[in-house]
């Protein structure tokens, strides 16, 4: 502890100019004081001034008022510093002396004489309030005040609590009157050494080194570090934990860069045709009548649908067509006949049946012939039965579809997986991707088809955690961790409640 006992001398009265021994001072009592402060004694005794002692210069002659003076000789109040815990009790001896000698250092003069002395014993709490007192004897009167205050940086009822205001690495605070700490704005903690981060800064994902800051931990971003960073290269996906790539609707693949909904995203089918998705970047356009081509972008001739019946010839007109009917037929499509079975209207061995009491007829055609009069050889390709750009070919009584690579089925309606051909060697796993199959190789193999045996095994160091399976070869000089249920991350290091939908590339 550390503090100061302060004694303020106010007035001394010695009207007759007398010494304690009854003699008078000539020409007057040139008065100075000796003060002795010590531990509490029920009966004051001579001996060391255990709490300190001080002397004044000559302050006046006989009777005088003592003015406050804060520097130089004759300082008032008098200061008695101590470097211990203030016990709360004390004994004080104030002696008034006459000196015939030096005004400034009367202590050293010979022939000094005692005028009077007073003794105070009691308790005194630390505080700023002065305790005022007055002591009289038969010859003199002394008025004075005293108090105990703590030294700078010391606090508490016994001046034992050290507190020094601080604004550095290990504290940012001021001291309260009781010595407790009061944190400066922006700081917290018992010792005010912890910065208060930017309001809203995520407790786990962000931190700060100074107030109103928010520094993100790896895998997090944003002003408040509450946004996860998705897997590097993630195109059309999001994350709920760092390095994830959960695909948006209509996207697939490791980096969500494969378009599973090409129809919606690109609208490739023209002229009101219907678009059907068929795998990554795959689609089929079903054309309305009068259109053809992969995207139904080609307008057919108005006569292409052979609208003229009964051997009528079709002639294109602007936005329409016109049928030139053969003899015996009439109507917009030559659908009405003026002929009867008697006119032998059925060709190619067709049988004639009379209708409407012989006023009209109908031909029943043999196989491979069609038309009102069996005049047309059947072309089974006219209905464009082959999907996905397949070529239709007539084969006698039937027709076949010659499919483009990657499609199969009677009408080329089925998309063949590139993986169906098992292109991956050495037990590699095949993935259908936009630009062809990609193989995920087992440990020890690499290359596009896992055909290369590698001497340095990227999986040898066991980079995958939580029981994940390690593969190499998905990308050059690299490995893939295929996470078990409940884990994600490039090395399957993050636990989650949901199963990963695909392996993570490290």
């Amino acid at each position: 502890g550390s503090g100061i006992f302060q004694l303020r001398l106010q007035e001394f009265v010695n009207q007759r100019g007398m010494l304690a021994n009854g003699q008078s001072c000539e020409p007057g009592c040139r008065t100075f004081f000796r003060i002795c402060l010590k531990h509490f004694q029920a009966t004051f005794s001579e001996g060391p001034c255990t709490f300190g002692n001080v002397s004044t210069p000559v302050l006046g002659t006989n009777s005088f008022v003592v003015r406050d003076k804060n520097s130089g000789s004759g300082r008032n109040p008098l200061q008695l510093p101590f470097n211990f815990t203030w016990p709360g009790t004390f004994s004080l001896n104030i002696q008034a002396w006459h000196t015939p000698g030096d005004d400034l250092r009367p202590e050293t003069s010979p022939g000094n004489s005692l005028i009077s002395q007073i003794i105070i014993q009691g308790s005194l709490a630390v505080g700023k309030i002065w305790r005022t007192d007055e002591q009289n004897d038969t010859l003199t009167r002394l008025s004075y005040s005293y108090r105990v205050i703590c030294s700078d940086n010391y606090y508490g009822e016994s001046c034992s609590r050290l507190c020094k205001k601080r604004d550095d690495h290990f504290g940012h605070y001021e001291c309260q009157p009781d010595g407790s700490l009061s944190c400066l704005p922006g700081w917290t903690g018992k010792y005010c050494d912890q910065p208060i981060c930017l309001s809203g800064c995520h407790e786990q994902n962000g931190y700060c080194s100074k107030p109103d800051e928010c520094i993100c931990r790896p895998g997090w971003q944003g002003r408040l570090c509450n946004e996860c960073i998705p897997h590097n290269g993630c195109r059309h996906g999001t994350c709920s934990i760092p390095w994830q790539c959960a695909c948006d609707e209509g996207w697939g693949g490791l980096f969500c860069d494969q378009d599973l909904n090409y129809c919606t995203h690109h609208s490739p089918c023209k002229n009101g045709s219907t678009c059907s998705n068929s795998g990554p970047k795959g689609y089929t356009c079903t054309c309305l009548p009068g259109y053809t081509g992969e995207h139904c972008e080609l307008g057919l001739s108005k006569c292409a649908s052979n609208p003229c019946r009964n051997g009528g010839s079709c002639k294109d007109q602007e936005n329409s067509y016109h049928c030139l009917c053969p003899p015996g037929y009439y109507g917009q499509h030559c659908e009405h006949s003026t002929l009867t079975c008697a006119d032998s209207p059925c060709f190619n061995g067709g049988s004639c049946r009379e209708r409407n009491q012989g006023s009209s007829y109908a031909c029943e055609c043999p196989p491979n012939f069609t038309g009102s009069n069996c005049e047309k050889k059947v072309d089974r390709c006219t209905s464009n039965p082959c999907a996905n750009g397949g070529q239709c070919q007539n084969r006698g009584p039937s027709r076949t579809c010659r499919c483009r690579p990657g499609f199969t089925g009677t009408h080329c309606e089925l998309h063949i997986s590139d993986c169906a051909r098992s292109p991956c060697a050495h037990g590699g796993t095949c993935h259908d991707l936009e630009n062809g199959p990609v193989c995920t190789c087992p440990a020890g193999f690499s290359g596009r088809r896992c055909e290369v045996r590698i001497t340095h095994d990227a999986c040898a160091s066991g980079p995958c955690f939580n029981g994940a399976t390690c593969y190499t070869g998905l990308s050059p000089n690299n490995f893939v961790c295929n996470c078990p249920y409940g884990f994600v991350g490039s090395r399957c290091e993050f636990p989650v409640g949901l199963p990963p939908s695909f392996p993570w590339v490290a």
Partner: antibody, heavy 121, light 104 residues
Framework: EVQLQESGPGLVKPSETLSLTCTVS??????????WGWIRQPPGKGLEWIGD???????YYNPSLKNRVTISVDTSKNQFSLKLSSVTAADTAVYYC?????????????WGQGTLVTVSS | SYELTQPPSVSVSPGQTASITCSGE??????VSWYQQKPGQSPVLVIY???KRPSGIPERFSGSNSGDTATLTISGTQAMDEADYYC?????????FGSGTKVT
């Protein structure tokens, strides 16, 4: 009682990066109230404070070294590390790790035994 | 940058009092720690927050700090106290050590 142990290469080539690790035993590096610091002492010279870190990741560096130094903490391993890049012969020193205690006003009450790092080609 | 200055050496007879000073601008406004370092050993904290002794440090070690000067006092110096002594303070977020004083 907490003990600290420095580890790392004793020889580093000029312009390379010096890397040291301090392993804390007998106590958790995640305890609040402690900063974990690095101090160095060139042969025959005085002590120089390099920087320190709090378990939450807050780092503080000596301005004279700030653009070359990185201190990091790995609470799972109870370790903290020092990286000093682009070293020169002037970085040859005994490197100490220490625990600075908040309740001691920042006094470092526990020190490692120190490891001598020589920068030479 | 903030600097702390110490005398290079202080000589003292056994049983006498050794005083080591540490000077810096307005140092009394800062808390000062003192470290003892014997040859080939790591430093040991002997005084923190100007005048407080960690447990295990003998009572003969005391400290004070006011104005521009902090002082480490070793009263009744013993042969085992022969060592280098460093003062240390915090300037903002940066630790600063004094140049060191050899006590013989």
């Amino acid at each position: 009682e907490v003990q600290l142990q420095e580890s790392g290469p004793g020889l580093v080539k000029p312009s390379e990066t010096l890397s040291l690790t301090c392993t804390v035993s007998g106590g958790s590096i995640s305890s609040s109230g402690y900063y974990w610091g690095w101090i160095r002492q060139p042969p025959g010279k005085g002590l120089e404070w390099i920087g320190d870190i709090y378990y939450t990741g807050n780092t503080y560096y000596n301005p004279s070294l700030k653009n070359r130094v990185t201190i990091s903490v790995d609470t799972s391993k109870n370790q903290f590390s020092l990286k000093l890049s682009s070293v020169t012969a002037a970085d040859t020193a005994v490197y100490y790790c220490a625990r600075e205690e908040v309740i001691l006003g920042g006094g470092a009450d526990q020190w490692g035994q120190g490891t001598l790092v020589t920068v030479s080609s | 940058s903030y600097e702390l200055t110490q005398p290079p050496s202080v000589s003292v007879s056994p049983g006498q009092t050794a005083s080591i000073t540490c000077s810096g601008e307005s140092l009394g406004d800062k808390y000062v720690s003192w470290y003892q370092q014997k040859p080939g050993q790591s430093p040991v904290l002997v005084i923190y927050e100007d005048s407080k002794r960690p447990s295990g440090i003998p009572e003969r070690f005391s400290g004070s700090n006011s104005g521009d000067t902090a002082t480490l006092t070793i009263s009744g110096t013993q042969a085992m106290d022969e060592a280098d002594y460093y003062c240390q303070a915090w300037d903002g977020e940066t630790g600063v050590f004094g140049s060191g004083t050899k006590v013989t």
